[in-house]
Interface confidence: low
């Protein structure tokens, strides 16, 4: 046969086939602990391979940590009636390697989602938006925690991991209401340039413990609500004028830059001048040079223009090996 078009609209209600019968309001799934008073269900470290189908309708906080879920399919939490109260969902450390499109659909109150410490070889572009429309219905998510979701090297495939995560964050512009985004410890070499433009409500952004070398193509300009920007433990060598101006222009921001291998040569002059006058950088007195060797461990705030020189570039005929 010939290939069919794959365009299709999202279902107005995606029921879990396994839960056609409404769950009893007070039942607790096997291998879980439930507290109706606290509106909390904990199914922790039980080696579950699937999301329990019989979750109680009162659940507001659901912990499914330390399991072996492997795959979250579309409608993994869709129930009839829906889990309308579920506000916080923690799936960290559950050996997820695939999150499919629409995995979190039909959770109308879901404000916090933690997928940390899962080796996500595959994150659907529509994991959070639930549909492949260019503009999706807004997601209710306010906090999205994606720390250490990078898969091991042998499972990273050929696609850019940064690009895969970015696609999920921007799809359908569904995450415009997101306030907190944690992307620490993901071996990011770069931040795709369009991501932050699609997340205008961000107040807290954690990119610490990655491998970011440069922020040259990243724009912070429209993050006017940003309060905390964590860039500690990356591979940043210098922040250039454009980035400095954008950060200075954000009214509430505090930036954390510790433990980056700052290169203290002539390209660092603008950043040093800015550091001396800005109140934006927290702990700026702790920032030290890593290179060149003669500048190692020098405090950036104590440098002056005479310290920041670049070795002259020799003409090719005078260069030696």
């Amino acid at each position: 046969t010939s290939s069919a078009s794959s365009s299709s609209s999202s279902a107005p209600f995606l029921a879990s086939a396994a839960s056609a019968q409404p769950p009893l309001p007070d039942q607790c799934p096997a291998l879980c602990e439930c507290s109706e008073a606290a509106r909390t269900v904990k199914c922790v470290n039980r080696n579950l391979t699937e999301v329990p189908t019989d979750l109680p309708l009162y659940v507001r906080n659901l912990f499914l940590t330390g399991n072996q879920l492997a795959v979250l399919p579309a409608g993994a939490f869709a129930r009839r009636p829906p889990l309308a109260e579920l506000a916080a969902l923690n799936l960290s450390g559950s050996r997820l390697d695939e999150v499919r499109g629409g995995a979190f659909e039909h959770l109308p109150s879901l404000r916090q989602l933690d997928l940390s410490h899962n080796p996500l070889a595959y994150l659907s572009p529509f994991a959070f938006s639930g549909s492949n429309a260019s503009i999706s219905a807004p997601s209710p998510l306010v906090e999205l925690i994606l720390n250490h979701i990078v898969p091991p090297d042998d499972k990273r495939q050929n696609r850019s991991f940064e690009g895969m995560v970015a696609a999920a964050l921007v799809a359908g512009r569904a995450l415009q209401g997101l306030h907190l985004l944690e992307l620490a410890s993901n071996h990011f070499l770069y931040l795709p340039r369009d991501v932050l433009a699609q997340l205008p409500s961000l107040r807290y952004l954690d990119l610490s413990n990655n491998s970011l070398v440069s922020l040259t193509y990243v724009s912070f300009r429209n993050l006017t609500h940003l309060e905390s920007l964590h860039l500690e433990d990356n591979a940043l060598k210098v922040l250039h004028n454009g980035t400095l101006a954008e950060l200075q222009g954000l009214p509430h921001v505090r930036v954390f830059l510790d433990n980056n291998p700052w290169v203290c040569d002539c390209h660092m002059a603008d950043m040093v001048t800015w550091l001396k006058q800005t109140g934006v950088v927290q702990g700026k007195d702790r920032l030290t040079c890593a290179f060149p060797e003669k500048m190692r461990n020098r405090v950036l705030l104590e440098l002056n223009s005479a310290d920041l020189d670049c070795d002259p570039i020799l003409p090719p005929s005078l260069q030696t090996s």
Partner: antibody, heavy 123, light 107 residues
């Protein structure tokens, strides 16, 4: 041209295992879910499960949990189904079928099918 | 699991006639239904998806429709190559399930 080429017929003894292959060509293998469907003689079709070739993540029909294991080899664009602890009930034709593209969670119909592999379980 | 009940189980018709096969879902599956044709000893072929979208290359004498949880496949002016078995399948939520099939025979 999209093609799914399955391995040949199998005659196996009860209690044994068998692994059937499905080699895909004519499209980007890692962009589409691969499904496996069972058809017992003269009967209807049963969906066994699907696998995302990009990640290797599989979803099985509960009925086939413990019976079928789905895997892929991306380097050869080949999907596999391994059936274990075989009984006469497992005698059937097994089809691989291409499912939805990776970003569309609703297009779970099967637009291309392999030619089918006949499995006979007999002592 | 969602059950798909297909009727009739078998049907005899002549070339040129119009026939309708129906499929009922045990619960609301919206428009997430596909129809397949299968000839003896061959693989199924996709005819219709999303209840009424015709697969490229399928003749326009085939059409699909939906009314609530009941779905129909209509074949106008039957041709000799249309005889075989037909199956419906929902593509709403796992596990995807098929109807029991309708065998369309030549009268």
């Amino acid at each position: 041209e999209v093609q799914l080429q399955q391995s040949g017929p199998e005659l196996v003894k009860p209690g044994a295992s068998v692994k059937i292959s499905c080699k895909a060509s004519g499209y980007t293998f890692t962009d589409y879910y691969m499904n496996w469907v069972k058809q017992s003689h003269g009967k209807s079709l049963e969906w066994i499960g699907d696998i995302n070739p990009y990640s290797g993540g599989a979803t099985n029909n509960q009925k086939f949990k413990g019976k079928a294991t789905l895997t892929v080899d991306k380097s050869s664009s080949t999907a596999y189904i391994e059936l274990r602890s075989l009984t006469s009930e497992d005698s059937a034709v097994y089809f691989c079928a291409r499912g939805s593209i990776y970003y569309d969670s609703t297009a779970n119909y099967f637009d291309y099918w392999g030619q089918g592999t006949t499995l006979t379980v007999s002592s | 699991d969602i059950q798909m009940t297909q009727s009739p189980a078998s049907l005899s018709a002549s070339v040129g006639e119009t026939v309708t096969i129906t499929c009922r879902a045990s619960e609301n599956i919206y428009s997430y239904l596909a129809w397949y044709q299968q000839k003896q000893g061959k693989s199924p072929q996709l005819l219709v998806y999303n209840a009424k979208s015709l697969t490229e290359g399928v003749p326009s004498r085939f059409s699909g429709s939906r009314s609530g949880t009941q779905f129909s496949l209509k074949i106008n002016s039957l041709q000799p190559e249309d005889f075989g078995s037909y199956y419906c399948q929902h593509h709403y939520v796992t596990p995807w399930t098929f109807g029991g099939g309708t065998k369309l025979e030549i009268k």
